[in-house]
C-alpha cells in the first residue's frame, strides 16, 4: 500500500509536471505567438484511456514530437527555457511517475489532436490524478 510520504512525492511530481505542461500551453496560446497556425498543423496522438499513472507511457512516447514542434518557436515566439532541458525534465518526471515495473503498450485513439488539444488532455489527466490524491 502507498505510504503518505510516497503519495506526497507523487503529488509533488504531478504538480511539477502539470506546471510544465501549463507553461508550454500558455506560451503557445500567447496572442503574440505568430507560430500558432503552423504549430496547429502538426498532429499529436492521444491515449484511448488515461486514468492511471502507468498511462503516462503514452505521453512519454509523444515527447520527441512535442520537442520538435516546440523547437519551431523557441526563440521569438514564446519564452520557454531551453526546449531540450524542458522536455528532458518532463521525461524524468514521467519515467518516475509511471514506474518501470510494468511495460505498458500504449493504446492510441484513432483521431489525432493538435498540440493544444494534446497538452490540454495531459493537463486534465494531471489534475484528475492530483484530485484523487488530495
Amino acid at each position: 500500500a502507498p505510504t503518505s510520504s510516497s503519495t506526497k512525492k507523487t503529488q509533488l511530481q504531478l504538480e511539477h509536471l502539470l506546471l510544465d505542461l501549463q507553461m508550454i500551453l500558455n506560451g503557445i496560446n500567447n496572442y503574440k505567438n505568430p507560430k500558432l497556425t503552423r504549430m496547429l498543423t502538426f498532429k499529436f496522438y492521444m491515449p484511448k484511456k488515461a486514468t492511471e499513472l502507468r498511462h503516462l507511457q503514452c505521453l512519454e512516447e509523444e515527447l520527441k514530437p512535442l520537442e520538435e514542434v516546440l523547437n519551431l518557436a523557441q526563440s521569438k515566439s514564446f519564452h520557454l527555457r531551453d526546449t531540450k532541458d524542458l522536455i528532458s525534465n518532463i521525461n524524468v518526471i514521467v519515467l518516475e511517475l509511471k514506474g518501470s515495473e510494468t511495460t505498458l503498450m500504449c493504446e492510441y485513439a484513432d483521431e489525432t489532436a493538435t498540440i493544444v488539444e494534446f497538452l490540454n488532455r495531459w493537463i486534465t489527466f494531471c489534475q484528475s490524478i492530483i484530485s484523487t490524491l488530495t
Partner: antibody, heavy 121, light 113 residues
Framework: QVQLVQSGAEVKKPGSSVKVSCKAS????????IHWVRQAPGQGLEWMGW????????NYAQKFQGRVTLTADTSTSTAYMELSSLRSEDTAVYYC??????????????WGQGTLVTVSS | DIVMTQSPDSLAVSLGERATINCKSS????????????LAWYQQKPGQPPKLLIY???TGQSGVPDRFSGSGSGTDFTLTISSLQAEDVAVYYC?????????FGAGTKVEIK
Amino acid sequence: QVQLVQSGAEVKKPGSSVKVSCKASGYSITDDLIHWVRQAPGQGLEWMGWIDPEDGETNYAQKFQGRVTLTADTSTSTAYMELSSLRSEDTAVYYCARSLDSTWIYPFAYWGQGTLVTVSS
Amino acid sequence: DIVMTQSPDSLAVSLGERATINCKSSQSLLRRGNQKNHLAWYQQKPGQPPKLLIYDASTGQSGVPDRFSGSGSGTDFTLTISSLQAEDVAVYYCLQSYITPPTFGAGTKVEIK
C-alpha cells in the same frame, strides 16, 4: 510545381564569407521551412539548419552555430545562407531544400540544384 | 544525435537482379502514435541533388518506379531494388527524419556487375 533555384558557383578565399541564394516558386515561401544541406566532394550529406521564412526563426546544427546565418526575403521569395570564416573544408555543394509537406519538418522532397562553393587561397 | 549506419559501402549487381541496402539507426525511429517509422531513402546521381524515393520507411514517393521498396521498423531498415536497371546506378542514402538534427547514412554506391 515547387521549384528552388539557387545562385551560381563561388570561389572564395579562406577567412572570407559566402552568401548563397535560393529562390522559391510554385508555392508561397512562407508556407514551409527552408533547410540547407551541404555535401563535400565525394562525401555524404550534412544538414546545416532551417529557417522559417514567415518570421525569420532559425534552427542551426551545432557544428555550424556561430558561423552560419540563414535569412529570407518574403518579398522576393528568396532564402539565403551565409557562411563566414571559410576554410578549405567548407568546399562543398550547398543545397536548399523543402520538406515533403507542412505536416512534419522532414524529410526533404524538393531540392535546389546546388551551389558549388570552393574555398582556395 | 542519431547515428545512421549504412551497409554495404558499395554494391555491384547484375542488370535485372535484386539490390539490397541496409540502414541501422542508433535510436528507434518508430513513432508509436501513428505506427510510422521516420526514415527516408534518397537516390543521388553525379551532379544532381538527392531525389526522395521512399519516406515513412515504406511509402513510395509519387512518380518513383515500384521496383524501389522500403521495409523495416524501429532501428533496422532496408531499401530493395527488385530488378536493377541501368538508370539505377547511383549513390543511395538513408535519412532519419524524426528528430533534429536530421542525419544521413554515409551512402551506398550501386554499380552494375
